[in-house]
Interface confidence: medium
């Protein structure tokens, strides 16, 4: 699986979409999990409704919500009030029994709030103790990176 990068602005909501083959994954519940280290397990954050027919209903765990369009074949995860510690590697999964198929590998990048003067975002330079004023990246951008080309997840 290639990894898709989703960028969101700190304090705002980020929507992550995971398309899948609706026929292949018919009747399967879905889940959103966080990758713990490069080779570590994927820790479940939230999963769709226990009744597959009700998968369209939004389920929440803290600031993370999940909903599944089973006909269209799109799993949508919403991260509310995005924070730097939300940055990292995740997976969208399709569940069957005790097994899980990976639908998409995701890297969430958290960008500083353009109005937040505490962080310089993309104009911060490590060689100076004083940072630039703003962060300047559009809300909710996604792009694909090839395997081996993934930047380290940002840290708080």
């Amino acid at each position: 699986h290639n990894t898709t990068v989703f960028q969101g602005v700190e304090g705002q909501s980020l929507q992550v979409s995971c398309p899948y083959d609706s026929m292949k994954h018919w009747g399967r519940r879905k889940a959103w999990c966080r990758q713990l280290g490069e080779k570590g397990p994927c820790q479940r954050v939230v999963s769709t409704h226990n009744l597959w027919l009700l998968s369209f209903l939004r389920r929440r765990n803290g600031s993370t919500a999940i909903t599944d369009d089973t006909l269209g074949g799109t799993l949508t995860i919403t991260l509310r009030n995005l924070q730097p510690h939300d940055a990292g590697f995740y997976q969208c999964q399709s569940l069957h029994g005790s097994e899980a198929d990976t639908l998409r590998k995701v890297l969430v990048e958290v960008l500083a709030d353009p109005l937040d003067h505490r962080d310089a975002g993309d104009l911060w330079v490590p060689g100076e103790s004083e940072s630039f004023e703003d962060a300047h990246v559009e809300h909710s951008i996604s792009r694909s990176l090839l395997e081996g080309e993934i930047p380290f997840p940002p840290t708080s």
């Epitope: 960028q7 602005v9 730097p84 940055a87 990048e109 958290v110 960008l111 500083a112 353009p114 109005l115 962080d119 975002g121 993309d122 104009l123 911060w124 330079v125 490590p126 060689g127 100076e128 630039f132 004023e133 703003d134 962060a135 300047h136 990246v137 559009e138 809300h139 930047p151 380290f152 940002p154 840290t155 708080s156």
Partner: antibody, heavy 122, light 113 residues
């Protein structure tokens, strides 16, 4: 698709003034820092100035400090460079560039406009 | 200011052969807090604006062919084109994104032998 289109270049006498503009489209302009980078004919790249997304903070290269002013109008999605007291050594193609974002990524430029040529000569 | 020095000034390489460009910074651009080197590479084809290829010394920008790779740490860096293609004819610039003012190397012109 992100597009940056510079304008305002031309021939100006030493000591004269010129204002460059860069019209941006395809992204939320106010969320991004922007920069000017210049390239003298047949020479390398020289960073000139940068401005934050809100326009509240600016940086300048020593070679232009006090003579050039970077500004932006977020309602018009336009970046400006006011150039005063121009010298022959300011002759260059001036590129407008969008700065990448993200925690920990220092200032890198992507993408760039096609550039506008400023010639300072008597 | 950090001075960036590139070598060679120009390079002629046969199609399919390896091209290697060096860049040296006058002070380290390694940030110890995250162990990243704040060094970027750009490609400028004739009559075009520059294009970002690599940042953090070795992280390829999305869409950049994997024949382009960056390496090095501290003050010494290398851009390698593993198998030169006709479309790689360009001037390549290194840039430090470690401290203001941002500075570029003088450029290396890559041609086909």
């Amino acid at each position: 698709e992100v597009q940056l289109l510079e304008s305002g270049g031309g021939l100006v006498q030493p000591g004269g003034s010129l204002r460059l503009s860069c019209a941006a489209s395809g992204f939320t302009f106010s969320n991004y820092a922007m920069s000017w980078v210049r390239q003298a004919p047949g020479k390398g790249l020289e960073w000139v100035s940068a401005i934050s997304g809100s326009g509240g903070s600016t940086y300048y290269a020593d070679s232009v400090k006090g003579r050039f002013t970077i500004s932006r109008d977020n309602s018009k999605n336009t970046l400006y460079l006011q150039m005063n007291s121009l010298r022959a050594e300011d002759t260059a193609v001036y590129y407008c560039a969008k700065l990448r974002g993200g925690y920990e990524v220092g200032p890198t430029f992507d993408p760039w406009g096609q550039g506008t040529l400023v010639t300072v000569s008597s | 200011d950090i001075v960036m020095t590139q070598s060679p000034d120009s390079l002629a390489v046969s199609l399919g052969e390896r091209a290697t460009i060096n860049c040296k910074s006058s002070q380290s651009v390694l940030y110890s807090s995250n162990n990243k080197n704040y060094l970027a590479w750009y490609q400028q084809k004739p009559g075009q604006p520059p294009k970002l290829l690599i940042y953090w010394a070795s992280t390829r920008e999305s869409g950049v062919p994997d024949r382009f790779s960056g390496s090095g740490s501290g003050t010494d860096f290398t851009l390698t084109i593993s198998s030169l293609q006709a479309e790689d004819v360009a001037v390549y610039y290194c840039q430090q994104h470690y401290i203001w003012p941002i500075t570029f190397g003088g450029g290396t012109k890559v041609e086909i032998k």
